[in-house]
């Protein structure tokens, strides 16, 4: 594949990553492999910059994340390690919280009104942001 | 309820071309990527390609690049394919389908490529 | 492109067993997964995404299971209504693909 160089048509760059804002909601899996699609993958939040600029482009609607506890343990999907890693989870969350008797817990994470993080079930349907990274080889062949 | 509602059987002739539709109803249109799918007789399912209504965006199976043009009007809520150049191994039925996964499908359009 | 093996190509069956449909992929597409049944003269239908999510409307005897390059689809005790093709699909990456597909038939 070819290096990607600039951010693709209605993304946003910012700080060498490509940014997309969803206006639907879906599930946690349909907006995982929405991205994934897209050559991307939800939005690893890093830094407390990269925070504040995608809390400033969502404002205050829930939105999925690519943060997720699903086999265990909590994992972002680009691979970033989550204990080392930036954190700004709501006081007391992630809890894990059965009681919205939709049955199991709350596996998947999200940005709140405020920014903050939450875990809630993965079958609601959040807006969410894809991120790519400028200069990674993309997937899509060199146009000839 | 959503419902996708393509339109009728087509016989036409060698080397002519064909545009079929796919009106929808019942959910956001551009919210889902529509897919057009190809099963020959007593076949299996071949994915041709999907246009992303909020922007047009297309993508092809390789195979069917230069075969079939997807594309899509908004206002209708309908997607098209245009098949051209059509020989018999174009005879077939052409679903239309919803998102990456195929939640919903259309009935079928009944290709048949005849001289 | 990632190619979707199915096996058996046939399976005969008498209504009431449990029967087990595989989906092997080319290469991993972790739980990007989906089940179809296609009846006679009519549209697929989704039975069961992302590996083993179940879809409403579908009744609780179909299951899937698997993640990486082996899949599984289920039907945990089979009924006369189930006869007919199961295709599996990816959605790892483009382009999108089946399986050549498994027939379920009475034995």
């Known amino acids: 594949g070819s290096e990607r160089t600039c951010c693709p048509v209605n993304w946003v760059e910012h700080e060498r990553s490509c940014y997309w804002f969803s206006r639907s909601g879906k599930a946690w899996a349909d907006a995982d492999n929405y991205c994934r699609l897209e050559d991307a993958h939800l939005v690893v939040v890093t830094s407390w910059e990269e925070q504040k600029f995608v809390q400033h482009h969502i404002g205050p609607v829930n939105t999925w994340m690519g943060l997720h506890d699903q086999n265990g343990p909590w994992k972002w999907v680009d691979g970033t390690d989550y204990e080392t890693g930036f954190k700004n989870w709501r006081p007391e969350q992630p809890d894990d919280w059965y009681g919205h008797g939709l049955g199991g817990g709350e596996d998947c994470a999200h940005f709140t009104d405020d920014g903050r993080w939450n875990d809630d079930v993965c079958q609601r349907p959040y807006r969410w942001v894809c991120e790519t990274e400028l200069d990674k080889a993309s997937q899509e062949p060199p146009l000839l | 309820e959503v419902q996708l509602q393509q339109s009728g059987p087509e016989v036409v002739k060698p080397g002519a071309s064909v545009k079929m539709s796919c009106k929808t109803s019942?959910?956001?249109?551009?919210?889902?990527?529509m897919n057009w799918v190809k099963q020959g007789h007593g076949k299996s399912l071949e994915w041709i390609g999907r246009?992303?209504?909020?922007?047009?965006?297309?993508r092809y199976n390789q195979k069917f690049k230069g075969k079939a043009t997807l594309t899509v009007d908004k206002s209708l809520s309908t997607a098209y394919m245009q098949l051209n150049s059509l020989t018999s191994e174009d005879s077939a039925v052409y679903y239309c389908?919803?998102?990456?996964?195929?939640?919903?499908w259309g009935q079928g359009t009944t290709l048949t490529v005849s001289s | 492109d990632i190619v979707l093996t199915q096996s058996p190509a046939t399976l005969s069956v008498t209504p009431g067993d449990r029967v087990s449909l595989s989906c092997r992929a080319s290469?991993?597409?972790?739980?990007?997964l989906h089940w179809y049944q296609q009846k006679s003269h009519e549209s697929p239908r989704l039975l069961i995404k992302?590996?083993?999510q179940s879809i409403s409307g579908i009744p609780s005897r179909f299951s899937g299971s698997g993640s990486g390059t082996d899949f599984t689809l289920t039907i945990n005790s089979v009924e006369t209504e189930d006869f007919g093709m199961y295709f599996c699909?990816?959605?790892?990456?483009?382009?999108?693909?089946f399986g050549a597909g498994t027939k379920l038939e009475l034995k």
């Open positions: 389908t919803r998102w990456f996964y195929f939640d919903y």
């Open positions: 019942g959910f956001t249109f551009t919210d889902y990527y």
């Open positions: 246009v992303n209504p909020s922007n047009d965006d297309t």
């Open positions: 290469q991993s597409i972790s739980n990007y």
């Open positions: 992302f590996a083993s």
């Open positions: 699909q990816q959605s790892n990456s483009w382009p999108l693909t």
